[in-house]
Interface confidence: medium
Amino acid sequence: TEVKVTQPEKSVSVAAGDSTILNCTVTSLLPVGPIRWYRGVGQSRLLIYSFTGEHFPRIRNVSDTTKRNNMDFSIRISNVTPEDAGTYYCVKFQRGSSEPDTEIQSGGGTEVYVLAK
């Protein structure tokens, strides 16, 4: 069956300077390939976090994704700023051998509202 990506929250509200968790789970780790988080859609979408080892300031994974059969790809964003507002998508990719990774499934999106402190 096709992998399913679920973001249960439609939206989260967070005060500027605080941290927030964006939840995402998948039903399968197959096909092999990374999970990435983006803000926005289309041409304007911005990579926020990738579960591939790179360092992303202010963002870290919530659970230990190195553990076997971990299906939780939630992230925590620290020290939230007004610029962090927007809709965040958790996206599953299939790894390409020579060609780029292929996006195969996206969560429904979670809108982040940033409130003034």
């Epitope: 679920t6 249960p8 439609k10 989260v12 789970t25």
Partner: antibody
């Protein structure tokens, strides 16, 4: 106080159409996703359809897909359900339900309107 | 589609007794589960969300517990107004949103 008032129910023959309305008050209607949920006589609750606050996102249960159309008019604070090609199994009380702003559970419900499909 | 199975179908109890209602999910819904009460001729009423959080105005004799696939709604001491049908609903999965088949709590 949140109020949801359904109307438009009645007796209709199989194959015919009916349009239900739900008038909302007491909250910022355009900021909330709203749903139709139905209950056939002696049966449990069955989710029918949902529409996002802006009207851009719409989902239907498989049992009504292609026959029912959900819509909303935010200027009138009203939700609609256009029901075409009605069947006997569509006989139910139809509830309008307002979703929580963060999750897809229902924190406010209307009293319901009865739709009876019978020849 | 996530299937919710409620048991028992009917619970016959006396006022003052404790009621324990069960809801089982076909796959994990974490704690994304709500409980509703429905009385004849009335709109359903939200009781519990997040598996264990009471909705506004709900008396503390109602409590919810569980996570993953097993959930329980407990009414610690049944009052006359508590005799009704109770439904669970998952909101973890994107639509279709699904309800359990309901448990009727009736007077013994």
């Amino acid at each position: 106080e949140v109020q949801l008032v359904e109307s438009g129910g009645g007796v209709v023959q199989p194959g015919r159409s009916l349009r239900l309305s739900c008038a909302a008050s007491g909250f910022t209607f355009s900021s909330y996703d709203v749903n139709w949920v139905r209950q056939a006589p002696g049966k449990g609750l069955e989710w029918v359809s949902l529409i996002s606050g802006s009207g851009e996102i719409i989902y239907y249960a498989d049992s009504v897909k292609g026959r029912f159309t959900i819509s909303r008019d935010n200027s009138k604070n009203t939700l609609y359900l256009q029901m075409n090609s009605l069947r006997a199994e569509d006989t139910a009380v139809y509830y309008c339900a307002k979703e929580n702003n963060r999750y897809r559970f229902f924190d406010d419900w209307g009293q319901g309107t009865l739709v009876t499909v019978s020849s | 589609e996530i299937v919710l199975t409620q048991s028992p179908g009917t619970l016959s109890l006396s006022p003052g007794e404790r009621a324990t209602l069960s809801c089982r999910a076909s796959q994990s819904v974490y704690t994304y589960l709500a409980w509703y009460q429905e009385k004849p001729g009335q709109a359903p009423r939200l009781l519990i969300y997040g598996a264990s959080s009471r909705a506004t105005g709900i008396p503390d004799r109602f409590s919810g517990s569980g996570s993953g696939t097993e959930f329980t709604l407990t009414i610690s001491s049944l009052q006359s107004e508590d005799f009704a049908v109770y439904y669970c609903q998952q909101y973890y999965d994107r639509p279709p949103l699904t309800f359990g088949g309901g448990t009727k709590v009736e007077i013994k």
